[in-house]
């Protein structure tokens, strides 16, 4: 014998108190699949969370984080603070990058400057807390006897030092 509740579509629930009639989900609740005996309470995006998608009778609300924070965890269950460029987020808050490292993002960790000499190149632009060094021509190319100067090589992908 077929379960009468299986006919109840998403957005409704099978109401045992009313002879298993399919009743619409009450306000601030939803059912995302058919045949449900209850509707789930909608997620509320409060405080540091803000609403990315409103709850409907068939789908839960979706939250993201207010400016200055970014999502972590499944379905944005947490908001982690952004840091400034030139900083990294540690367990004890935002800390400035140590000398010789940089971070050009508002999240993630500080990474070492590229070592230009490993590629036989010179430093064209010094690194900062916010930016990697820019490698230029090799010192040999700049020596007085060199016949031509090769154009500066494009900067290496930030933080990816040669293996």
């Amino acid at each position: 014998l077929q379960d009468p509740c299986s006919n109840c579509p998403a957005g409704t629930f099978c109401d045992n108190n009313r002879n298993q009639i399919c009743s619409p989900c009450p306000p601030n609740s939803f059912s995302s699949a058919g045949g449900q005996r209850t509707c789930d309470i909608c997620r509320q995006c409060k405080g540091v969370f803000r609403t990315r998608k409103e709850c409907s009778s068939t789908s839960n609300a979706e939250c993201d984080c207010t400016p200055g924070f970014h999502c972590l965890g499944a379905g944005c269950s947490m908001c982690e603070q952004d840091c400034k460029q030139g900083q990294e987020l540690t367990k004890k808050g935002c800390k400035d990058c140590c000398f010789g490292t940089f971070n050009d993002q508002k999240r993630g960790i500080c990474r070492p400057w590229t070592n230009c000499s490993l590629d036989g190149k010179s430093v064209l632009v010094n690194g900062t807390k916010e930016r990697d060094v820019v490698c230029g021509p090799s010192p040999a190319d700049l020596s007085p006897g060199a016949s031509s100067v090769t154009p500066p090589a494009p900067a290496r992908e930030p933080g990816h030092s040669p293996q």
Epitope: T90, K91, K92, I109
Partner: nanobody, 124 residues
């Protein structure tokens, strides 16, 4: 599938105690450091405590030092947070998290798996 399931949250009066648990499955529990973090209403994540895989090394945020104790039972694949002398400012959702190394650190987050959280409300 790696899973972390917190329990033990609830409503408690200031000065009271609670013990949170985090049941872990799907990985070799003793091989990884574990961490508790919390998120108070309207605020960002705050690190609470970290324990090494063996349980030998523990670290605490200054805000909970002397009041909270992190521990683990590797035979039961369970992480604990004993919270004493609770204050209103401890009100938060508490998340347990797996780090991707056995070594505990009080500097970097090395978290690769999060639990769903358990709510602790401290109010009279």
């Amino acid at each position: 599938e790696v899973q972390l399931l917190e329990s033990g949250g609830g409503l408690i009066q200031p000065g009271g105690s609670l013990r949170l648990s985090c049941a872990a499955s799907g990985f070799t529990f003793s091989s990884f450091a574990m961490t508790w973090v919390r998120q108070a209403p309207g605020k960002g994540l705050e690190w609470v405590s970290t324990i090494s895989g063996s349980g030998d090394n523990t670290y605490y945020a200054d805000s909970v030092k002397g009041r909270f104790t992190i521990s683990r039972d590797n035979s039961k694949n369970t992480l604990y947070l004993q919270m004493n002398s609770l204050r209103a400012e401890d009100t938060a959702v508490y998340f347990c998290a797996k780090e991707d190394t056995a070594v505990a650190s009080d500097y970097y987050y090395n978290i690769d798996v999060w639990g769903q959280g358990t709510t602790v409300t401290v109010s009279s």
